[in-house]
């Protein structure tokens, strides 16, 4: 898995005037990690542990930087000509990759009222859009801004991919974020469905990076992907990740079921409770 | 390459115990079940049982209930079948198998022939 | 337990020709659960095909398997010389995890 560095910015316009509120969005290593209020910009570090890699001395930088791209993004979003009446939405997302052979990747991608509209490749600044004629006549609108003002774009969109990069080394040299590994909690649950039957639900939480197997075996074999059903993997806020898998068996079966769990080259065998409820923490 | 490689055959008499040993290589040791499977000469395959490493759980087909006893040693990584109270019957080839990912049964020992002989 | 049935008991059949091997069950088996082996004298039995259909990872595709509920199929399209062993249906569906007595398939 490569670190990366997600920002994603929205503004807003009504009946063609742009808002002076804005959004912003950044995640580091897919996970949620600063936000950019509206109104008032303060880069606000979800969870402790994005405030142990920034620390209060760096929020200044972020939220001046933040700022200045929320504004640029609104100054964009005003030269966006022909705007029809009601709410409409700018948003511009740019991502950055440093992978473990120390390559790297970026791009940038515009969506209007949530429709993909212009990408640019920020390393050979190669642009792309889709082939709609609605998307194209936007993509030509934005980057005939982009150009007209020369220096900001030398200066501005194109030193993003080297900003970005920057920024990312800068989050990474904390330490906190690291190659770091958490192993899961598991916590296998039982519960009555149609009578007998018993749906049976195995959870991994607290556990990162975010790549996980979990999966219901019955005597060592997994059983087949339409008899299982898998929640998705998501933050859970504290720079870590959950997830879920259940099935239903035959009451009287349990000792035949097992929850299986692979994370970070180890992994761990979690039984059907007898009771309603077993917490097992990994031990390896 | 994934393995399992058995004890060597054993000669019995009738009432005695026997233990064949079943280590696998090439996976990671607690992460599959072993089963045990066994075949009387010019006969069909007959399940035992299987024990899951990681957890130590074992499952027994009825028939060897009270017979057979599986366990494991995680520090070496080695799989145990005892059967015990032997009679001329279990005279037979004792296969460990490892379980697989989509069925019971994916790679399998080279075997141990038990003999039971007076 | 489910007793399974294979047959014929033994097939004789020349390189070449086909092979339709029958594995009856004594009560219906999800397709998830029904595995097919092979196995050569003084050999291991091999995984050949799983969850009725799938071939096993090095299994030549003359090989397929078919079926559902109580009835399975095991086919070799087209016999080569290494394909006369014995082979051996198996249900995992519910315990006592049970075999076919198997098939013989002998060169004619």
């Known amino acids: 898995e490569p670190h990366s560095l997600r920002y994603n910015l929205t503004v807003l316009s009504w009946d063609g005037s742009v808002q002076s509120g804005f959004l912003t969005e950044v995640h580091l290593d897919g996970q949620p990690f600063l936000r950019c209020d509206r109104q008032k910009c303060r880069a606000k570090p979800q969870g402790q542990w994005a405030e142990d890699v920034l620390g209060n001395k760096t929020w200044d930088r972020e939220t001046r930087d933040l700022t200045g791209n929320g504004k640029d993004l609104r100054m964009t979003l005003a030269h966006i000509k022909d705007q029809k009446e009601g709410l409409h939405s700018l948003q511009e997302i740019r991502v950055c990759e440093i992978h473990e052979d120390n390559s790297t990747r970026s791009s940038q991608h515009f969506y209007y009222d949530g429709e993909l509209f212009l990408s640019q490749n920020l390393e050979t600044k190669e642009w792309t859009m889709p082939q709609s004629s609605r998307a194209q006549t936007l993509a030509m609108n934005v980057r005939n801004f982009l150009k007209e003002d020369a220096m900001k774009t030398k200066t501005h969109y194109h030193a993003m991919h080297a900003d970005c990069l920057q920024e990312l080394r800068r989050y990474l040299k904390s330490g906190v974020v690291l190659r770091r590994t958490v192993p899961p909690m598991v916590n296998v649950t039982r519960s009555e469905a149609s009578e007998g039957n018993i749906t049976v639900t195995c959870r991994a939480s607290g556990f990162y990076p975010w790549n996980i197997t979990l999966s219901w075996r019955q005597d060592g074999v997994s059983l087949s992907h339409d008899t299982q059903q898998w929640g998705d993997v998501l933050p859970d806020g504290n720079g870590t990740y959950q997830t879920w898998v259940a099935t239903r068996i035959c009451q009287g079966e349990e000792q035949r079921f097992t929850c299986y769990m692979e994370h970070s080259g180890n992994h761990s065998t979690h039984p059907v409770p007898s009771g309603k409820v077993l917490v097992l923490q990994s031990h390896w | 390459e994934i393995q399992l490689v058995q004890s060597g055959a054993e000669v019995k008499k009738p009432g005695s115990s026997v233990k064949v040993s079943c280590k696998p290589s090439?996976?990671?040791?607690?992460?599959?079940?072993i089963y045990w499977v066994r075949q009387a000469p010019g006969q069909g395959l007959e399940w035992i049982g299987y024990i899951d490493p990681y957890i130590g759980r074992i499952i027994y087909n009825q028939q060897f209930k009270d017979r057979a006893t599986l366990t494991v040693d995680k520090s070496t990584s080695t799989a145990y079948m005892e059967l015990s109270s032997l009679r001329s019957e279990d005279t037979a080839v004792y296969y460990c198998s490892r379980s697989g990912e989509r069925s019971n049964f994916d790679y399998w020992g080279q075997g141990t022939l038990v003999t039971v002989s007076s | 337990e489910i007793v399974l049935t294979q047959s014929p008991a033994t097939l004789s059949l020349s390189p070449g020709e086909r092979a339709t091997l029958s594995c009856s069950a004594s009560s219906s088996i999800s397709s998830n659960y029904l595995h097919w082996y092979q196995q050569k004298p003084g050999q291991a039995p091999r995984l050949l095909i799983y969850?009725?259909?799938n071939l096993a990872s090095g299994i030549p595709a003359r090989f397929s398997g078919s079926g559902s509920g109580t009835d399975f199929t095991l086919t070799i399209s087209s016999l080569e010389p290494e394909d006369f062993a014995v082979y051996y249906c198996q249900q995992g569906g519910s315990l006592p995890l049970t075999f076919g007595q198997g098939t013989k398939v002998e060169i004619k």
């Open positions: 969850r009725t259909s």
């Open positions: 090439g996976y990671a040791f607690t992460s599959n079940n």
